[in-house]
Amino acid sequence: DAEFRHDSGYEVHHQKLVFFAEDVGSNKGAIIGLMVGGVVIA
């Protein structure tokens, strides 16, 4: 028998991506980071 058409079995879990910039002083530039699910990854 042919299979009935269904979507792929995995489920997509959405996470919020938050970009942030933090000023650390006029002579030190800025730190730019990417936080995924509460963890800074860059």
Epitope: D1, A2, E3, F4, R5, H6, D7, S8, G9, Y10, E11
Partner: antibody, heavy 122, light 112 residues
Framework: QVTLKESGPGILQPSQTLSLTCSFS??????????VSWIRQPSGKGLEWLAH???????RYNPSLKSRLTISKDTSRNQVFLKITSVDTADAGTYYC??????????????WGQGTSVTVSL | DVLMTQTPLSLPVSLGDQASISCRSS???????????LEWYLQKPGQSPNLLIY???NRFSGVPDRFSGSGSGTDFTLKISRVEAEDLGVYYC?????????FGAGTKLELK
């Protein structure tokens, strides 16, 4: 809320073509993953799946009836149609349409119409 | 076609009893995507069928927790922990993995 309602001729004669309409509200067949199936039930007997149509106009049929079945849709009017050619008394019963989305958590026939009764008589 | 065999075909119960319905498929109904599309529907007298359980063990919205589904591969079970009057009717198992989609013959849950 989601509702579906079937309509048909009520009575028709052997060898005629049965035309059924499923009119629905609360969802759209333009939504990716959406689909509608037709199911029938001879009086006092069990359920038989007939056909299914997807949002992208892909279709599936019960092979035992495929040569006699045509499923189609009018997305803008929120309607799905089923035609069965060359009806016989064995085609009598209650015909249901049911929603079956494939891109939601509940990939099943989650909402059904009330059914429409079909009699085949000389 | 995938044959769905339900047992028993008739199940007399008293209110408050536990009820168990078995459904066996003639071949595995595990889809290539990993899901098992085994569903249970209840048809009360004079009404349309209603979805109770999907993907073997998931209760549909509004279905009381006295209903539970279990099983894998080809053997599946629907259990009702304490039967209430509103549970009476015909229960159908259904597979949605292979064309044609197929129902079991139904199990009539009725009062003794």
């Amino acid at each position: 809320q989601v509702t579906l309602k079937e309509s048909g001729p009520g009575i028709l004669q052997p060898s005629q073509t049965l035309s059924l309409t499923c009119s629905f509200s609360g969802f759209s067949l333009s939504t990716s993953g959406m689909g509608v199936s037709w199911i029938r039930q001879p009086s006092g007997k069990g359920l038989e799946w007939l056909a299914h149509i997807y949002w992208d106009d892909d279709k599936r049929y019960n092979p035992s009836l495929k040569s006699r079945l045509t499923i189609s849709k009018d997305t803008s009017r929120n309607q799905v149609f089923l035609k069965i050619t060359s009806v016989d008394t064995a085609d009598a019963g209650t015909y249901y349409c049911a929603r079956r989305p494939i891109r939601t958590v509940v990939d099943a026939m989650d909402y059904w119409g009330q059914g429409t009764s079909v009699t085949v008589s000389l | 076609d995938v044959l769905m065999t339900q047992t028993p075909l008739s199940l007399p119960v008293s209110l408050g009893d536990q009820a168990s319905i078995s459904c066996r498929s003639s071949q595995t109904i595990v889809h290539s995507n990993g899901n098992t599309y085994l569903e249970w529907y209840l048809q009360k007298p004079g009404q349309s069928p209603n979805l109770l359980i999907y993907k073997v063990s998931n209760r549909f919205s509004g279905v009381p927790d006295r209903f539970s589904g279990s099983g894998s591969g080809t053997d599946f079970t629907l259990k009702i922990s304490r039967v209430e009057a509103e549970d009476l009717g015909v229960y159908y198992c259904f597979q949605g993995s292979h064309v044609p989609l197929t129902f079991g013959a139904g199990t009539k849950l009725e009062l003794k």
